[in-house]
């Protein structure tokens, strides 16, 4: 059989058939089914859901569906000894205590096993001391406090508002500043959009709502006790003192009703400027400590959570490829939730479920993809991307040789305004071409393409007439595939209007109020945005698995490499004297980027012209495309972050959610003016330029003619 015959038994089995089979009503039903009870990682409920998904994926027609289990470190509150924060008077009496749970939403009052708000992996402790308000607890916020305002956080309990950066970075920054405890809270400025009611009457956060979340700084390690290797039945586990990424000080999250009680008493310094003020009716004084009559009162934390090695379960489904079964296209999203998971993750899991059902329908009619498609329902994402990372560690040898692409499928929506895509530059053209073929679900864009509404609402800052596509950061299950293994990756979801809604994420993120009704009543009553996201994610998987030539354009990598080189050069040029003194040159990097550009251009020309009926040449060209992302991997990893090995992209050292380009050079340059040994610091900059230049040149050579 020709490759065409193998992948299209009858002409109707094409992308259109796959997309037409996707139904909004099914996604709605699946979402309802997945959100009726909590599915916290490590619990019986989540194990049962794993088995249900396994069973349904088999029914849908996948060739095999297996559970892959691991025993990883998780964290839970103590059921009999709750976590809370108090204000204590000079006699040590508790005169105010924060709430022990969120008031349950209507209809869920009798649901058991709702985990109370907590910061996963917080150590136990009962620190007491003066409070310091540290804004978002970003690196620049601590610079402001320590360097500008001369406020010492050592021995203090800090209170930080959620938003802007990953909470784990906030905790790390607080630890480095010497704090002895961290209180995290959701400020209405970030989690209450003006003109919208709070849940259950709207999609805003009520005062008793609290964001859960882990506070690890894993830097891609996966299970804290088994970094680099799977947490299987014969694993060697580190002692807790040697575990990766655990915080060393107690941390606890609260809502804005409780935060008001703490912040209203704050004394010390006024906030340095308007960017430190939220929307509560408090002065946002920084401290340290309380004002006036309250100056003898302190804050005390009571944290009793425990870390426990617990079994987790991934569901791995396989749809074998007809022509290249040893080439894997992976669609994965997590299943575990903090509570009901109405958006995170089940709006994504419901979409994956419907994509599997559509592929299964085609398979039952005799169709197979050209390449193998793997579907994954990951566990313990909320505890540090553990399920995906352990599975990738277990299967790393296969993945690095056979992995074509990974498409992530967490929350399908974080708003209902427009599309949001983060991906490798290799996928830009795939995303553009696909969205041009899909209908926009947006009001006012009837009959127009998704590409058109997306470009209009979220234009590229660099290229007119094109939509914004962002860099991949982390904070989700693509991390191990992209940042560690160098497998081309992408993600897509519907998002909010970032210009008019300044709140961080969506207001009810990781709260008990993230329910099915939140989605069905307020975000997507017709499930049309979910359907569009299913079409984008599913369409990308279909094309990656089925196109004869992989839909990767290496020329787009050349364009961004030049942009990133220009950007990092301009950062370095803020120090012209030092660059001269220490002979810092970016010539090697710009030369490598120029070579990459030329070689990529020639490769693309050959890609147009080669004989696609020659399976050996076809496979050779596809392998060059598949392995290009892999070529950006440095086996030694980034400094102090061995599992972040991609030289072009890494999660920002200051915000895990954000991607940074040329991260090795960027981190070497960061705050370089404060380094005690400038010669050593600029030497590291030079070394990182060398590593980047070498890597870009080496990647370019993988695209050269093989002989």
């Amino acid at each position: 059989k020709s490759s065409n015959e193998a992948t299209n038994i009858t002409p109707k089995h094409n992308m259109k058939a796959f997309l037409d089979e996707l139904k909004a009503e099914n996604i709605k039903k699946f979402l309802y089914n997945f959100t009726q009870i909590p599915h916290l990682a490590g619990t019986e409920q989540n194990f049962q859901l794993a088995k249900q998904i396994q069973s349904q994926w088999k029914e849908f027609g996948l060739d095999s569906v297996e559970l892959a289990h691991y025993d990883v470190l998780l964290s839970y509150p103590n059921k009999t000894h709750p976590n809370y924060i108090s204000i204590i008077n000079e006699d040590g009496n508790e005169i105010f205590n924060t709430s022990l749970f969120e008031p349950p939403p209507p209809g869920y009052e009798n649901v058991s096993d709702i985990v109370p708000p907590f910061s996963a992996f917080s150590p136990q402790g009962m620190p007491e001391g003066d409070l310091v308000y540290v804004n978002y607890a970003r690196t620049e916020d601590f610079f402001k406090l320590e360097r500008d305002m001369k406020i010492n956080c050592s021995g203090k309990i800090v209170i930080a508002r959620y938003g802007k950066v990953f909470r784990g970075n906030k905790v790390k920054n607080a630890q480095l500043a010497g704090a002895k405890g961290v209180i995290l809270y959701s400020d209405p400025a970030d989690y209450f959009a003006p003109g919208v009611k709070s849940y259950p009457d709207g999609w805003n956060l009520p005062g008793g709502g609290v964001q859960r979340g882990n506070i690890l700084n894993l830097n891609g390690a996966g299970d804290p006790l088994t970094p680099g290797y799977p947490a299987n039945e014969y694993a060697y586990r580190r002692g807790i003192a040697e575990a990766v990424g655990l915080p060393s000080i107690p941390v606890h999250p609260i809502g804005y009703y409780d935060a008001q009680k703490l912040l209203e008493k704050m004394g010390g310094s006024a906030p340095p400027d308007s960017s430190w003020r939220g929307s509560l009716k408090v002065p946002y004084n920084v401290g340290p400590g309380f004002t006036g009559n309250f100056s003898t009162q302190k804050v005390k934390m009571h944290i009793h959570s425990t870390n426990e090695v617990t079994r987790i379960y991934n569901v791995i489904g396989t749809l074998r490829g007809a022509v290249e079964p040893d080439r894997y296209v992976i669609l994965g999203g997590h299943r575990d939730s903090w509570v009901f998971g109405g958006i995170d993750p089940q709006s994504g899991a419901a979409v994956v479920h419907e994509i599997v059902r559509s592929f299964g329908t085609l398979k039952k009619e005799g169709w197979r993809p050209r390449r193998t498609i793997l579907f994954a329902s990951w566990d313990a994402e909320e505890f540090g991307l553990l399920g995906s990372t352990e599975w990738a560690e277990e299967n790393s040898r296969l993945l690095q040789e056979r992995g074509v692409a990974y498409i992530n499928a967490d929350s399908s929506i974080e708003g209902n305004y427009t599309l949001r895509v983060d991906c490798t530059p290799l996928m830009y053209s795939l995303v553009h071409n696909l969205t041009k073929e899909l209908k926009s679900p947006d009001e006012g864009f009837e009959g127009k393409s998704l590409y058109e509404s997306w470009t209009k609402k979220s234009p590229s800052p660099e290229f007119s007439g094109m939509p914004r596509i962002s860099k991949l950061g982390s904070g989700n299950d693509f991390e191990v595939f992209f940042q560690r293994l160098g497998i081309a990756s992408g993600r897509a979801r519907y998002t909010k209007n970032w210009e008019t809604n300044k709140f961080s994420g969506y207001p009810l993120y990781h709260s008990v109020y993230e329910t099915y009704e939140l989605v069905e009543k307020f975000y997507d009553p017709m499930f049309k945005y979910h359907l569009t996201v299913a079409q984008v994610r599913g369409g990308m998987v279909f094309e990656l698995a089925n196109s004869i030539v992989l839909p990767f354009d290496c020329r787009d990598y050349a364009v961004v490499l030049r942009k990133y080189a220009d950007k990092i050069y301009s950062i370095s040029m803020k120090h012209p004297q030092e660059m001269k003194t220490y002979s810092v040159s970016f010539d090697s990097l710009f030369s490598a980027v120029k070579n990459f550009t030329e070689i990529a251009s020639k490769f693309s020309e050959r890609l147009q012209d080669f004989d696609k009926s020659n399976p050996i040449v076809l496979r050779m060209m596809n392998d060059q495309l598949m392995f290009l992302e892999r070529a950006f991997i440095d086996p030694l990893g980034l400094p102090d972050r061995p599992f972040y090995r991609h030289v072009i992209y890494a999660p920002s050292s200051h915000n895990k959610y954000a991607g940074e380009s040329f991260p090795g050079i960027y981190d070497a340059l960061f705050d370089i003016e404060s380094k005690v040994d400038p010669s050593k610091a600029w030497g590291e900059v030079k070394r990182q330029i060398y590593v980047a230049a070498f890597t870009v040149q080496a990647a370019a050579e993988t695209l050269s003619e093989v002989a």
Partner: antibody
Framework: EVQLVQSGAEVKKPGASVKVSCKAS????????IHWVRQAPGKGLEWIGN????????TYNQKFEDRVTITVDKSTSTAYMELSSLRSEDTAVYYC????????WGQGTTVTVSS | DIQMTQSPSTLSASVGDRVTITCKAS??????VDWYQQKPGQAPKLLIY???TRHTGVPDRFSGSGSGTDFTLTISRLQPEDFAVYYC?????????FGQGTKVDIK
């Protein structure tokens, strides 16, 4: 060496606007608050407002709120204070000061408002 | 607005004297108080921040103390270069406010 160098003296008519600049050097401009303070002849110090050069966040003295705008240009490490609808009582020396605790001061800019 | 009231307004002293200037806040300001020195025709200079911490390069004859509403700047042994106007300032509430100044002149 930390330096804050302000623009030269200005003479303005009532109702006009004045924009005073303050160029910083010798430190990381984005890390430190810039305050603006004025001192009328023979009088004490009066705080006008401040800015965080990193993100442009400002706070103004309500007394001046409807007339003052403080901005920065990060590329040139320069802060600006613009005061509009000038009146004779705005005649003063205007200082910029760097650091939350007013660690370093510019040399001052004399603004004279006279018809 | 928080009022900062300095006393005395003028203080005549001799070289070598111990000089104390007080500053009273109209409400509790914790320790969020700075002290500045200004000489004629010059910009003010920071002496003390957070009520009691000397700024870099400030001689140790200058010291600050106090919390809540009552603050003191002390010059232990007055030097010729110390004749100037001294201002206290609070930074616990906006608008940031200064005392009216204390002029230290030669007796």
């Amino acid at each position: 060496e930390v330096q804050l160098v302000q623009s030269g003296a200005e003479v303005k008519k009532p109702g006009a606007s004045v924009k005073v600049s303050c160029k910083a050097s010798g430190y990381t401009f984005t890390e430190y608050t810039i305050h603006w303070v004025r001192q009328a002849p023979g009088k004490g110090l009066e705080w006008i407002g401040n800015i965080n050069p990193n993100n442009g966040g400002t706070t103004y003295n309500q007394k001046f709120e409807d007339r003052v705008t403080i901005t920065v240009d990060k590329s040139t490490s320069t802060a600006y204070m613009e005061l509009s609808s000038l009146r004779s009582e705005d005649t003063a020396v205007y200082y910029c000061a760097g650091g939350w605790t007013f660690d370093y001061w510019g040399q001052g800019t004399t603004v004279t408002v006279s018809s | 607005d928080i009022q900062m009231t300095q006393s005395p307004s003028t203080l005549s002293a001799s070289v070598g004297d111990r000089v104390t200037i007080t500053c009273k806040a109209s409400q509790d300001v914790g320790t969020a108080v700075d002290w500045y020195q200004q000489k004629p025709g010059q910009a003010p200079k920071l002496l003390i921040y957070w009520a009691s911490t000397r700024h870099t390069g400030v001689p140790d004859r200058f010291s600050g103390s106090g919390s809540g509403t009552d603050f003191t700047l002390t010059i232990s042994r007055l030097q010729p270069e110390d004749f100037a106007v001294y201002y206290c300032q609070q930074f616990t509430r906006y608008p940031l406010t200064f005392g009216q100044g204390t002029k230290v002149d030669i007796k």
